[in-house]
């Protein structure tokens, strides 16, 4: 049979066909039925729901739908022993206390199994001692403190605000400065839209809305007691002192009617400049310690908080493909959520729901894809991406073999503006082409496509006419997939205007007040942006499964590289005397650019002229397709970061939520200035870019003709 | 309708003691601080205690420090204060009332909500 | 926590305008922004008609207002109308976390 004739693809089943069958109004009544509880990670609520999901998928029509568990790191609080901080007085009163829990949202006041705000993996401890504010606790904000302002938080109990970057790099770098404790708190200048009330009137958060979070620093390891190997029966688990990530100093946080109690009393040095200021009616002082009257006064901080291994399920579901069941597809999202999961990630896991149900009704129409479609609902991805890691781990070599692609569906929604989408440069033409071919939800747009919509309002910085497609960081279950396996991944959600909200994510982000409400009546009624994201994922997981040639464009790649190594070099050339002084050149790199850009040229034109009808050549560049990103993989990993694999892109390691550019070089750069041994310091910077070079000529190879 | 209403005054004996309830509804009061405040017979008002929604916090007037406790059951969405060691001078018509603000930590940005008071004799 | 210190009375004619005083110390009115008043009819419980010094609760009439200056705040109504008559009280946070009254004004409208 012909590769159309074996996947059944007449005009009934085609894209339109499985585009046409998702409704809002199904995703709508998924969302209600997936936030009524909680579904924290480890618990049985959890379990039950991974249970109904696989019930439910397995009537939906996949072939299989199975759950794997592992028995993993979590972290929860102590239920008779709760955390908080005080201030005590000179004789050890405490005379304020921080909340033990937030004021629960109209109609969820009998809730049970409300987990109270926490830091996920802190360690237990009582420090007290001095405050100082450290803003948002960046690399540069330390850098501010302890370089020009000549502050010292070594023994200090630091209080940072949330947002610019990953909790779990605030911590670190907290942890670097000889902080004692940290206290994390959302300051409305980053929570709090001007104009829009807080919840339950509005999507803003009320001054007792707490976001919750991990704090570890895995770098990609998984479950932190079997860092590169599953957490299954028969797992050699590290003892606690040699786990991966996990921080030394207690950690808890707060919201800003606490915060305010807190900073209010805060005296020593003024805020360095008005960037350091949020919107309290506190004067942000840096401190170290409180003012005047109440400089006899201190911070203690309760942390109690225990780290138990506990057994955790994915939903892995499989809808084979009919002509090349050994090539994966994978459309995954988590299912844990830290309360209510509102947004995070139940619009995900609703729209995730409704593809797969779509998809099931095309195939009991007697339609497969070419390719296999996994579906994963993944477990404990708020405690590290512990679910999908460790499936991940305990598949690699499948993974590595048979891995086409990597969709990611978390949260649906963080706005309801536009489009945001962030995936490898292989996927731009495949984004670009199926919202061309979407129709936009957007007010304003009516009968005009999503890309129209999408490039008006996010319009690429470097190319016009076309929208702005992020680079891949982290945070998020695609991590293993795109960073550790190198296997193409994406993902596409809608978002907020970020020209004009300057907060941090959206503003309940893991608090309780993630609810269904909350989705329903403030930031998609209709579900109409639901539905976009549904058709943007499930139309890339159905091109991506069922094109005869793979939608991945190398091109692409190599203008990206070109602009990447513009940029590091220009970084670079911030030292021309140190560049000079130890031999640093880049024409490596360029060169290898060069060679990239020119092979990829010649691999798209055989790909117009290949004859497709011959399944070992169409078989073979689809090959050459699917393993160009497993091609920019180091089996070494970056420099402390084995994990993190990809040469051209890893997690920031001042942020793991954003992406960084040939990292190793990166990294090897950033504040060379301040190295002690600079001879060394510009020698790695060579070995990085040999590496890159290497790297980057290594991929452009596996696109010449074979033979 | 929003409603605080006060239940168990009484008169009663010095030194002995007596338990205040005050059953809220018509609003979420598992996220509202509350208070009690007092006033004696033809004088004026004296504030007495409050209770932090989730009862991390307590403040009492120094007048009935060690002697009175306040507490709170959000699942029966009730207030209570427990009187101790009661004088003749914590004769008073108790009121209970809401803080203005939902979830919040510093209870004095007013008190919207009163109830209509139970009254407290304590005589020999 | 002493009482703050109020004026025991205070009188005006319909239409007229009347101030009532509010004094403590810094360490309550003059060192936090929460000072609050109430209205109390003989034998109803206090209603709140201004809270953090200046603001109005839905509900209350413009014609009250509120201001602070240095450790005394002050509660003006303006147009006073026979309904007015009644008992005001302010109270204040203090340093200690607790909250004081003042001793009441009674305002009569001749």
């Known amino acids: 049979k012909s590769s159309n004739e074996a996947t059944n693809i007449t005009p009934k089943h085609n894209m339109k066909a499985f585009l046409d069958e998702l409704k809002a109004e199904n995703i709508k009544k998924f969302l209600y039925n997936f936030t009524q509880i909680p579904h924290l990670a480890g618990t049985e609520q959890n379990f039950q729901l991974a249970k109904q999901i696989q019930s439910q998928w397995k009537e939906f029509g996949l072939d299989s739908v199975e759950l794997a568990h592992y028995d993993v790191l979590l972290s929860y609080p102590n239920k008779t022993h709760p955390n908080y901080i005080s201030i005590i007085n000179e004789d050890g009163n405490e005379i304020f206390n921080t909340s033990l829990f937030e004021p629960p949202p109209p109609g969820y006041e009998n809730v049970s199994d409300i987990v109270p705000p926490f830091s996920a993996f802190s360690p237990q401890g009582m420090p007290e001692g001095d405050l100082v504010y450290v803003n948002y606790a960046r690399t540069e904000d330390f850098f501010k403190l302890e370089r020009d302002m000549k502050i010292n938080c070594s023994g200090k109990i630091v209080i940072a605000r949330y947002g610019k970057v990953f909790r779990g790099n605030k911590v670190k770098n907290a942890q670097l400065a000889g902080a004692k404790g940290v206290i994390l708190y959302s300051d409305p200048a980053d929570y709090f839209a001007p104009g829009v009330k807080s919840y339950p009137d509005g999507w803003n958060l009320p001054g007792g809305g707490v976001q919750r979070g991990n704090i570890l620093n895995l770098n990609g390891a998984g479950d932190p007691l079997t860092p590169g190997y599953p957490a299954n029966e028969y797992a050699y688990r590290r003892g606690i002192a040699e786990a991966v990530g996990l921080p030394s100093i207690p950690v808890h946080p707060i919201g800003y009617y606490d915060a305010q109690k807190l900073l209010e009393k805060m005296g020593g040095s003024a805020p360095p400049d008005s960037s350091w200021r949020g919107s309290l009616k506190v004067p942000y002082n840096v401190g170290p310690g409180f003012t005047g009257n109440f400089s006899t006064q201190k911070v203690k901080m309760h942390i109690h908080s225990t780290n138990e291994v506990t057994r955790i399920y994915n939903v892995i579901g499989t809808l084979r493909g009919a002509v090349e069941p050994d090539r994966y597809v994978i459309l995954g999202g988590h299912r844990d959520s830290w309360v209510f999961g509102g947004i995070d990630p139940q619009s995900g896991a609703a729209v995730v729901h409704e593809i797969v149900r779509s998809f099931g009704t095309l195939k009991k129409e007697g339609w497969r894809p070419r390719r296999t479609i996994l579906f994963a609902s993944w477990d404990a991805e708020e405690f590290g991406l512990l679910g999908s890691t460790e499936w991940a781990e305990e598949n690699s070599r499948l993974l590595q073999e048979r891995g086409v692609a990597y969709i990611n569906a978390d949260s649906s929604i963080e706005g309801n503006y536009t489009l945001r989408v962030d995936c490898t440069p292989l996927m731009y033409s495949l984004v670009h082409n199926l919202t061309k071919e979407l129709k936009s939800p957007d007010e304003g747009f009516e009968g005009k496509s999503l890309y129209e919509s999408w490039t008006k309002k996010s319009p690429s910085p470097e190319f016009s006419g076309m929208p702005r497609i992020s680079k891949l960081g982290s945070g998020n279950d695609f991590e293993v997939f795109f960073q550790r396996l190198g296997i193409a991944s994406g993902r596409a959600r809608y978002t907020k205007n970020w020209e004009t909200n300057k907060f941090s994510g959206y503003p309940l982000y893991h608090s309780v007040y993630e609810t269904y409400e909350l989705v329903e009546k403030f930031y998609d009624p209709m579900f109409k942006y639901h539905l976009t994201v549904a058709q943007v994922r499930g139309g890339m997981v159905f091109e991506l499964a069922n094109s005869i040639v793979l939608p991945f464009d190398c091109r692409d790649y190599a203008v990206v590289l070109r602009k990447y190594a513009d940029k590091i070099y220009s970084i670079s050339m911030k030292h021309p005397q140190e560049m000079k002084t130890y031999s640093v050149s880049f024409d490596s790199l360029f060169s290898a650019v060069k060679n990239f850009t020119e092979i990829a040229s010649k691999f798209s034109e055989r790909l117009q002229d290949f004859d497709k009808s011959n399944p070992i050549v169409l078989r073979m560049m689809n090959d050459q397709l699917m393993f160009l990103e497993r091609a920019f993989i180091d089996p070494l990993g970056l420099p402390d970061r084995p994990f993190y694999r990809h040469v051209i892109y890893a997690p920031s390691s001042h942020n793991k939520y954003a992406g960084e550019s040939f990292p190793g070089i990166y990294d090897a750069l950033f504040d060379i200035e301040s190295k002690v041994d600079p001879s060394k310091a510009w020698g790695e910077v060579k070995r990085q870019i040999y590496v890159a070079a290497f790297t980057v000529q290594a991929a452009a190879e596996t696109l010449s003709e074979v033979a | 309708e929003v409603q605080l209403v006060e239940s168990g005054g009484g008169v009663v004996q010095p030194g002995r003691s007596l338990r205040l309830s005050c059953a809220a509804s018509g609003f979420s009061f598992s996220g509202y601080g509350m208070h009690w405040v007092r006033q004696a017979p033809g004088k004026g008002l004296e504030w007495v205690a409050v209770i932090s929604y989730d009862e991390s916090n307590k403040y009492y007037a120094d007048s009935v420090k060690g002697r009175f406790t306040i507490s709170r059951d959000n699942s029966k969405n009730t207030l209570y204060l427990q009187m101790n060691s009661l004088r003749v001078e914590d004769t008073a018509v108790y009121y209970c009332?809401?803080?203005?603000?939902?979830?919040?930590?510093?209870?004095?940005?007013?008190?919207?909500?009163w109830g209509q008071g139970t009254t407290v004799t304590v005589s020999s | 926590q002493s009482a703050l210190t109020q004026p025991a009375s205070v009188s005006g004619s319909p239409g007229q305008s009347i101030t009532i005083s509010c004094t403590g110390a810094s360490s309550d009115v003059g060192g936090y922004n929460y000072v609050s008043w109430y209205q109390q009819h003989p034998g109803k419980a206090p209603k709140l008609m201004i809270y953090?010094?200046?603001n109005r609760p839905s509900g209350v009439s413009n014609r009250f207002s509120g201001s602070k200056s240095g450790n005394t705040a002050s509660l003006t109504i303006s147009g006073l109308q026979a309904e007015d008559e009644a008992d005001y009280y302010c109270s204040s946070y203090t340093i200690t976390s607790t909250l004081v009254f003042g001793g009441g004004t009674k305002l009569t409208v001749l």
């Open positions: 009332a809401r803080d203005r603000i939902w979830g919040s930590r510093g209870y004095y940005y007013g008190m919207d909500v």
């Open positions: 953090e010094v200046s």
